[in-house]
């Protein structure tokens, strides 16, 4: 028995057709993606293949401004024009609160939502019950499928899930649901989840009875033969697994941002074990043509993106210095404010030892394009933002080495004095430079906000310890020449979209007026 | 809406066999198991079996199994339940239920059918 | 197989009184429990599923709890209507399983 498995993951909001960066379409013969390009590929899909399902392996929220403006309800509504068979909670599907889950999204979906490692409890469980499931048995075809979910257990660190969820061990809560699948003589399970590419492995692996990942979260890219566009596979498409009871798991994920349409055919026995599989992601490019009722659809509800984005988030009364001429060359109130936006967006008072886990902030001065001028009424709009933040990138959370950090901070002024974008603004944090040194050595004080203290203080940075950092996407990934902090990472997690936290940050304040304050000093 | 209608009162003797049908409307047939839950008089319940309609896959009570068969009809979205080898003690009401294949609680229920062993 | 232990067997109670029936369950059986009610001579009725999920139509006063192995059915304030008896049932591990009944009276 033929099974087609059709996947997405980390869509992160782009409803509409992407460039190849997977940012704001520009010419549209060259995009990429969109609901209405993916609708296409599945129907063709569908029409010629028996038995096929179609899953999503979380985060469909936050990303651009579709998810500012309709707040998932898109993401319902599109996901159930697609008819989606099943979706798994991922951590930013929380960004909003468990309200800003269960009304727009689990109340809406016409598919089950999964997560076997959530469990709710006090007020919030009887209003939340039955509207995710740890699993669903879906009939394909003469045969049935259970499918598992489970959801990142950082994600109270990484979104906003509130007081009342627990986030369990993935394998721990597995198990027992997979055991439960067995029971009801379910003997063709798939593990659909967002706990990123390492833990698909490790559930592969551990996890008695699943017989195939679908992942998400770490944006992994698998590939057999030559890839199609620009992203580099980080191994074959599917990635086998061998569990400890010595059967083969594939284990799949298919990049991110709707850019390509995970394509996975397994082959079962009638004892419902894998014999083979095989596949490849499909990219999603403009040979494959919109599907012209999704596409008059996402242009009705795009009608109200373009209102938005004119409408006041906020005022500033000073001028908010986002210039090259500052940004790149000293520490710029444009800056700050975007710094002081990510780390408030990171508040998460988790354990009574820390007032957060996270306080500190990097930001490379090239990703700040415009400055705002404060005499147009002091008006803030997502326009003037999307001048400012222009390439749509996040705001991710990483774990660094104190040595890694140093590193980051000597690069940042390697060749000062050029314009060159890799000069570093902060928050939570203090450096001293001293440009007479010779480049590599050119950092004389590194002091950084305590986390682990009631009352915030600046402390010198230790190099062997391990701090948590707010930065772009862009630094993540060693943009900019910050190779270091890519090849010496010890965890990223995908943010929130870069203008969406300022955005937010501004609306909540109301009334901003950054301040240069000394957090960059040159001796 | 909803409904789960089965056939009528039976008396059966001792070692015979009886078959109760149960039809189904209101709902997709195919989507969900109808389960049989006995109930003898003034007694408690006792869950027998199920059958997925959707593609014949049956769940026993390993207590019945060898004495009952669950066949089904989707061309008339009926159920059947035919209980062999009857003794006096299978004198109950046999009731049919709708449940999710995949969480098996009951949520319809069918009126019951009263199977009287009596020699 | 499960057993699901339900208790009192009977009690008797009136009108406004908040009545708790308990089902022990005898391993964990991960909250898939539900809850029905039966009066003489009709086919049960399912009140709740999932320990606390209230079935559409079932009033606000019949609420559940518990984890684990313990489960408890709570009837806020009893009515009229409410006089019948109760069964719990397990859906974690076939066979599927019944408590034996609580028989509600009226005192």
């Known amino acids: 028995w033929e099974l087609t498995i059709l996947h997405t993951n980390d869509v992160h909001s782009r409803l509409e057709q992407t460039s190849e960066d997977s940012s704001k379409c520009v010419n549209a013969s060259r995009c990429m993606g969109g609901v209405a390009r993916l609708f296409t590929k599945v129907q063709q899909i569908r029409r010629a293949e028996p038995n096929v399902l179609l899953l999503d392996a979380g985060d469909q929220y936050q990303g651009t401004i579709w998810f500012t403006v309709y707040k998932g309800a898109e993401v319902a509504h599109f996901m159930n024009a697609l008819r989606y068979d099943a979706m798994a909670l991922g951590n930013h599907e929380f960004d909003n609160g468990v309200e800003g889950l269960i009304e727009p999204l689990l109340k809406e979906a016409k598919f089950p939502i999964l997560s076997a490692n959530i469990k709710a409890k006090g007020p919030l469980a009887s209003q939340i019950s039955g509207l995710y499931l740890p699993y669903k048995v879906l009939p394909v075809g003469d045969e049935v499928v259970g499918i598992v979910g489970y959801t990142s257990k950082e994600t109270p660190f990484l979104s906003n899930p509130g007081t009342n969820l627990v986030f369990e061990d993935e394998i721990t809560a597995l198990q027992p649901e997979v055991d439960k699948l067995k029971t009801l003589n379910v003997n063709k399970i798939i593990a659909l989840g967002h706990s990123g590419f390492e833990m698909d492995k490790l559930i592969a692996q551990k996890v008695r009875g699943v017989d195939v990942v679908v992942g998400g979260h770490s944006n992994t890219f698998l590939y057999t033969g030559n890839p199609p566009s620009k992203e580099v596979p980080a191994g074959k498409y599917p990635f086998i697994v061998t569990s400890d009871d010595g059967r083969k798991v594939p284990v799949v994920q298919a990049y991110a941002f709707g850019k390509y349409l995970g394509y996975l055919k397994i082959e079962f026995d009638e004892r419902g074990n894998v014999i083979s599989s095989h596949g490849n992601p499909i990219l999603l490019n403009s040979s494959i043509p919109e599907d012209p009722s999704i596409k008059a659809d996402i242009n009705k509800w795009r009608i109200k993106l373009d209102n938005y984005s004119t409408q006041e988030l906020g005022k500033t009364i000073v001028y908010l210095d986002g210039s090259s001429q500052s940004c790149r060359f000293r520490e710029c109130n444009m800056g700050n404010l975007i710094c002081d936006a990510m780390i408030n967006n990171n508040l998460r008072h988790t354990d009574e030892m820390f007032w957060n886990h996270v306080s500190m902030c990097i930001l490379n001065g090239g990703g700040i394009r415009s400055p705002i001028d404060e005499r147009n009424n002091g008006t803030i709009t997502w326009e003037n933002l999307a001048a400012v933040l222009p390439f749509g990138g996040t705001f991710d959370l990483v774990q660094l080495k104190g040595s890694t950090l140093k590193k980051a901070f000597e690069h940042s002024v390697h060749r000062y004095g050029q314009s060159t974008g890799e000069f570093l603004q902060v928050g939570g944090i203090h450096v001293v430079y001293d440009l007479s040194r010779k480049p590599g050595d050119r950092v004389v004080k590194l002091d950084v906000l305590c986390t682990k203290c009631r009352v915030p203080s600046y402390d010198p940075l230790k190099m062997d310890e391990v701090y948590k950092v707010i930065l772009p996407n862009f630094l993540a990934n060693g943009g900019d020449g910050f190779q270091m902090i890519k090849d010496e990472l010890l965890r990223h997690d995908s943010g929130d979209q870069d203008i969406n936290v300022v955005s937010t940050y501004i609306s909540k304040m109301k009334v901003i007026y950054p301040a240069v304050e000394g957090r960059i000093k040159f001796s | 809406q909803v409904q789960l209608v089965q056939s009528g009162a039976e008396v059966k003797k001792p070692g015979a066999s009886v078959k109760v049908s149960c039809k189904a409307s209101g709902y997709t047939f195919t989507t969900y198991n109808i389960h049989w839950v006995r109930q003898a008089p003034g007694q408690g319940l006792e869950w027998m079996g199920a059958?997925?309609?959707?593609?014949?896959?049956?769940s026993y009570n390993q207590k019945f199994k060898g004495r009952v068969t669950m066949t089904v009809d989707t061309s008339t979205s009926t159920v059947y339940m035919e209980l062999s080898s009857l003794r006096s003690e299978d004198t109950a009401v046999y009731y049919c239920?709708?449940?999710?294949?995949?969480?098996?609680?009951?949520?319809?229920w069918g009126q019951g059918t009263l199977v009287t062993v009596s020699s | 197989d499960i057993q699901m232990t339900q208790s009192p067997s009977s009690l008797s109670a009136s009108v406004g009184d908040r009545v708790t029936i308990t089902c022990k369950a005898s391993e964990g059986i991960y909250n898939r429990l539900a809850w029905y009610q039966q009066k003489p001579g009709k086919a049960p009725k399912l009140l709740l599923s999932g320990v606390i999920s209230l079935e559409t139509g079932v009033p606000s006063r019949f609420s559940g709890s518990g984890s684990g192995k313990d489960y408890t059915l709570t009837i806020s304030s009893l009515q009229p209507e409410d006089f019948a008896t109760y069964y719990c049932q397990q859906y974690w591990s076939i066979p599927w399983t019944f408590g034996g009944g609580t028989k509600v009276e009226i005192k």
């Open positions: 059958i997925f309609p959707g593609n014949g896959h049956i």
């Open positions: 239920a709708r449940g999710d294949y995949d969480e098996s609680y009951f949520d319809y």
